[in-house]
């Protein structure tokens, strides 16, 4: 089933390669088990930036080597993505799936247009 | 529960002719994107054609011209003619349902492009070969 998800149209990345936004998405029914991806579209191409699934009330789990992190509460998922450089400028999608109990709900938000901008490197004191 | 059930795969001849159907059923979306995807012997998935729920159509460069997509909103069903096959053509083709249009028009020309659509048909076979 359809499943509406929001997200901000465009966030800046911190000078420290950071960028942070809100995942929302309006589930239709009393989900306990919830999964996440975020999903990067550039140059004509998707990938998977990260996964997480989680249980309703609890924290949620990237792997080990992820480079996102994020907390959960109610229906809103804050994401934070770090290690970011300016090649990594792009469009980043929230993919959510309702995964139990039945029936499966899946929602993709617009996107997030996130800009990253390298800091210039500071110039050496003689 | 989504069902997707493709039929009207087959073995046909280079140059000739099949139908492809996926009927759906248990779906309520007021928009949406319908697609038709393949996936080659030890080849990833790749979106071979896409329809919205306002009947806007898009192809992959690779079948543009000979493939039409279309879909029959009274029997819930979403139709693949491919005409001018070639043995390139040979694959598993999967029906898909996205909930987002707005990715809808550029995934037939989107590596990864999968990652949209989240449900999916068990697939029918389509070998070009003489």
């Known amino acids: 089933k359809a499943m509406h998800v929001a997200q901000p149209a465009v966030v800046l990345a911190s000078s420290r390669g950071i960028a942070s936004f809100v995942c929302e998405y309006a589930s239709p029914g009393k989900a306990t088990e919830v999964r996440v991806t975020v999903l990067r579209q550039a140059d004509s191409q998707v990938t998977e930036v990260c996964a997480a699934t989680y249980m309703m009330g609890n924290e949620l789990t990237f792997l080990d080597d992820s480079i996102c992190t994020g907390t959960s509460s109610g229906n809103q998922v804050n994401l934070t993505i770090q290690g970011l450089r300016a090649m990594d400028t792009g469009l980043y999608i929230c993919k959510v799936e309702l995964m139990y109990p039945p029936p499966y709900y899946l929602g993709i938000g617009n996107g997030t247009q996130i800009y990253v901008i390298d800091p210039e490197p500071c110039p050496d004191s003689d | 529960e989504v069902q997707l059930v493709e039929s009207g795969g087959g073995l046909v001849q280079p140059g000739g002719s099949l139908r492809l159907s996926c009927a759906a059923s248990?779906?309520?979306?007021?928009?949406?994107?319908l697609g038709w995807f393949r996936q080659a012997p030890g080849k990833g998935r790749e979106a071979v054609s896409t329809?919205?729920?306002?009947?806007?159509?898009s192809y992959a460069d690779s079948v543009k011209g000979r493939f039409t997509i279309s879909r029959d909103n009274a029997k819930n069903t979403l139709y693949l003619q491919m005409n001018s096959l070639r043995p390139e053509d040979t694959a598993v083709y999967y029906c898909?349902?996205?909930?987002?249009?707005?990715?809808?028009?550029?995934?037939?020309?989107?590596?990864?492009?999968?990652?949209?659509?989240?449900?999916w048909g068990q697939g029918t076979l389509v070998t070009v070969s003489s």
């Open positions: 898909a349902i996205g909930p987002n249009p707005r990715y809808c028009s550029g995934a037939p020309n989107t590596r990864g492009a999968e990652h949209y659509f989240g449900y």
């Open positions: 329809i919205d729920s306002g009947g806007s159509t």
């Open positions: 248990g779906y309520t979306y007021s928009r949406h994107c």
